[in-house]
């Protein structure tokens, strides 16, 4: 077990031409917060895949209001570290996603609005217990500077936090087969710890964190009898080929959950919901106090000062169970209305509303731009009781939530060239054409085919779009 720590140093415009517009304005003050998502291994998974190593959200930064005419400076940051606790071994190689979010503090209908400003990702090697590693990542015109490290929580030590150290019981030597713990020579290596939940009756381990099964048992935690596993498996061979003429006993038959635990079947095994005071795969671990740290996923343990009194875990948002061991898929209840996208930020549930809707659950139907429904710096344009978004460079879609190459749609007609300028796409028209998107031919006598040429529009005029 241990903690991954992330320190954000600065978030602001990157070097080179094209400073980004400030994300805040006098009309729309805002503040930043950050989200980090960690995955084990050198994962190339999509940003939306689960943060298997954990995730964390920062506090909100100070409120910031742009000074008119000034380029975006480094923006004020939240205080403190982002900490992602990990329960098992530190994998050594990991992938990260760091998102910078903007919370708009204007007069929002239904509270503040959130939008993603920048997302950076990377794959790194990192040993636990090492020094802070510094990094710079760029997302578009933004630059994020940060440091990170992984540290083990006592009693774990080592580059993977798999070796456990405990104070020596005798002053001179460690127990049989156990070595002193470098660099803590006054402590000793503790006995091997198998994967959490590994069956104490049917499983064993030779390496920290593994779970190997005794003959006759299978499953990741050695809890499934071999005689029934192939028949239970929905993808397993048919009973005719295995000799399973009748279904084997179900995983909950005979209730494997001790101490009053209730059993529920899972696709490959079973799961026990334990009463307070007990935990473990079969609720077999008892006499637990808060000192044993029975609450997982950042749950707060109260009571249970001695083995005879029960403890209670107060779970953080997103987790449930007597030991906060179960992740709640709060988005499965589809709380966001009107096609809103549900976002579980860990500490809270957010709805990313479709254009035209606002409110904490996207319950407010907007007929115009009152709710500022355009994301990522897009500008809302009213018209006819509806609205549309004119998106900033690099974003597209109805509400500017899609990251896009502004030139990908070939917006410049008649062979015109599209350039991805930092201030918006620019069309350079081929000879003989003019207009915002090179859509109008220029007549040989110099007159344009515009029905009514706007004042100041010249043949060959480029136009830019924000």
């Amino acid at each position: 077990a241990g903690v991954f720590e992330l320190q954000i140093h600065s978030f602001g415009p990157g070097p080179g031409p094209g400073a980004p517009r400030s994300p805040c304005s006098a009309r729309l003050p805002c503040r930043l917060f950050f989200r980090v998502c960690l995955k084990p291994g050198l994962s190339e998974e999509a940003a939306e895949s689960p943060c298997a190593l954990g995730a964390a959200l920062s506090a909100r930064g100070p409120v910031y209001t742009e000074q008119p005419g000034a380029p975006a400076p480094d923006l004020p940051l939240p205080d403190g570290l982002l900490q992602v606790p990990f329960r098992d071994a530190w994998p050594g190689t990991f992938s990260f996603i760091i998102e910078t979010w903007r919370e708009e503090l204007g007069d929002q209908i239904g509270g503040p609005a959130w939008s993603l400003l920048a997302r950076v990702a990377g794959r790194r090697r990192l040993a636990a217990g090492g020094p802070w590693a510094r990094d710079i990542q760029r997302a578009g015109a933004w630059e994020l500077r940060f440091s990170y490290r992984a540290r083990c929580e006592p009693p774990a030590v080592g580059t993977a936090c798999t070796r456990l150290c405990r104070p020596r019981s005798a002053p001179s030597r460690c127990g049989p087969g156990l070595r002193p713990c470098a660099p803590l020579e006054d402590e000793c290596e503790a006995p091997l710890v198998c994967r959490a939940g590994c069956s104490p009756e049917h499983g064993f381990c030779e390496q920290p964190g593994e779970c190997r099964c005794l003959e006759g048992w299978t499953g990741p935690l050695c809890t499934v009898p071999v005689s029934t596993s192939s028949c239970l498996s929905p993808r397993g061979p048919s009973s005719a080929t295995t000799g399973c003429l009748v279904p084997g006993p179900g995983p909950c038959d005979g209730n494997p959950c001790a101490n009053g635990g209730s059993c529920s079947e899972t696709p490959r095994s079973f799961e026990c919901t334990c009463p307070r005071g007990f935990y473990g795969l079969r609720c077999e671990v008892s006499g637990v106090t808060c000192a044993d740290g029975p609450c997982f996923n950042g749950g707060l343990c109260v009571g249970g000062a001695d083995p005879d009194s029960a403890y209670i875990c107060h779970c953080p948002p997103g987790f449930q169970g007597s030991n906060c061991e179960k992740r709640v898929d709060r988005c499965s209840l589809q709380p966001c209305r009107n096609g809103g996208l549900c976002l579980d930020l860990g500490h809270a549930l957010r709805c990313r509303c479709r254009a035209g809707f606002a409110g904490p659950r996207c319950e407010h139907d907007l007929d115009d731009c009152a709710g500022r429904a355009c994301a990522n710096g897009g500008t809302c344009v009213e018209g006819g009781g509806a609205h549309r978004c004119s998106c900033a460079l690099g974003f597209g879609g109805r509400d500017c939530r899609e990251r896009a190459d502004p030139c990908a749609a070939r917006p410049c007609a008649h062979g015109g060239r599209c350039y991805a300028h930092f201030s918006g796409l620019v069309c350079a028209c081929a000879p003989g054409y003019m207009g915002a998107r090179c859509e109008f031919p220029v007549h040989p006598d110099g007159a344009s085919a515009l029905p009514a040429a706007p004042p100041g529009l010249r043949p060959g005029d480029p136009q830019r779009y924000l």
Epitope: P17, R138, D405, R417, H421, L425, A428, R464
Partner: antibody
Framework: QVTLRESGPALVKPTQTLTLTCTFS?????????MGWVRQAPGQGLEWMGT????????DYASWAKGRVTISVDTSKNQFSLKLSSVTAADTAVYYC???????????WGQGTLVTVSS | DIQLTQSPSFLSASVGDRVTITCQST????????LSWYQQKPGQPPKLLIY???NLEIGVPSRFSGSGSGTDFTLTINSLEAEDAATYYC??????????FGGGTKVEIK
């Protein structure tokens, strides 16, 4: 960091073909730019040679360069290159690669590489 | 061929002076304002000062300004400083996707 860096031979013999490479980093050609070559003879002014447009890989060359200059892109290596055929002493210059992202200006330049044509 | 003519080709001025460089094109630049100005010091690549005739590039001191449209353009240095000693070039972009540079103006500090 967004950078351009030219590389190639410092010395070329007359009548040979000069090949220069510009390696870029910090951006990708999935967006649309003009990637260009500009040269500067010793003590002289800047001279545009040609550009390649990354939207469709079409090329445009200065009138004097047509037939002598070829510009191409290797997206897999993040490089674009210049070939100048039948070089003479008059082609001795510092060669720059540069990027245009709209409004007609080169906003990003390499440091330049000096090429001398001599036998 | 399109020609961009800069004048003067050389000028010597004192610190604090107001300096003006002109650039004339034989053809109108694209969109009437796709003209830029660069500063170049020995051994360095050109540095963008002004784009689209009058837009000051980020990080460039405000004593530099540009004006003009069509075929006639001007670069002004309001109060010359010692570090402004350099060669200045105008550059145009033209219909048909071509570029051209002016011949340059060398600015020397007296």
């Amino acid at each position: 960091q967004v950078t351009l860096r030219e590389s190639g031979p410092a010395l070329v013999k007359p009548t040979q073909t000069l090949t220069l490479t510009c390696t870029f980093s910090g951006f990708s050609l999935s967006s649309s730019y003009d990637m260009g070559w500009v040269r500067q003879a010793p003590g002289q002014g800047l001279e545009w040679m040609g550009t390649i447009y990354t939207g469709d890989y079409s090329t445009d060359y200065a009138s004097w360069a047509k037939g002598r200059v070829t510009i191409s892109v290797d997206t897999s290596k993040n490089q674009f290159s210049l070939k100048l055929s039948s070089v003479t002493a008059a082609d001795t210059a510092v060669y720059y690669c540069a990027r245009h992202t709209g409004y007609g200006y080169f906003g990003l330049w390499g440091q330049g590489t000096l090429v001398t044509v001599s036998s | 061929d399109i020609q961009l003519t800069q004048s003067p080709s050389f000028l010597s001025a004192s610190v604090g002076d107001r300096v003006t460089i002109t650039c004339q094109s034989t053809e109108s630049v694209y969109g009437s304002d796709w003209l830029s100005w660069y500063q170049q010091k020995p051994g360095q690549p050109p540095k963008l000062l002004i784009y689209q005739a009058s837009n000051l590039e980020i990080g460039v001191p405000s004593r530099f300004s540009g004006s003009g449209s069509g075929t006639d353009f001007t670069l002004t240095i309001n109060s010359l400083e010692a570090e402004d000693a350099a060669t200045y070039y105008c550059q145009g972009y033209y219909s048909g996707y071509s570029y051209a540079f002016g011949g340059g103006t060398k600015v020397e500090i007296k």
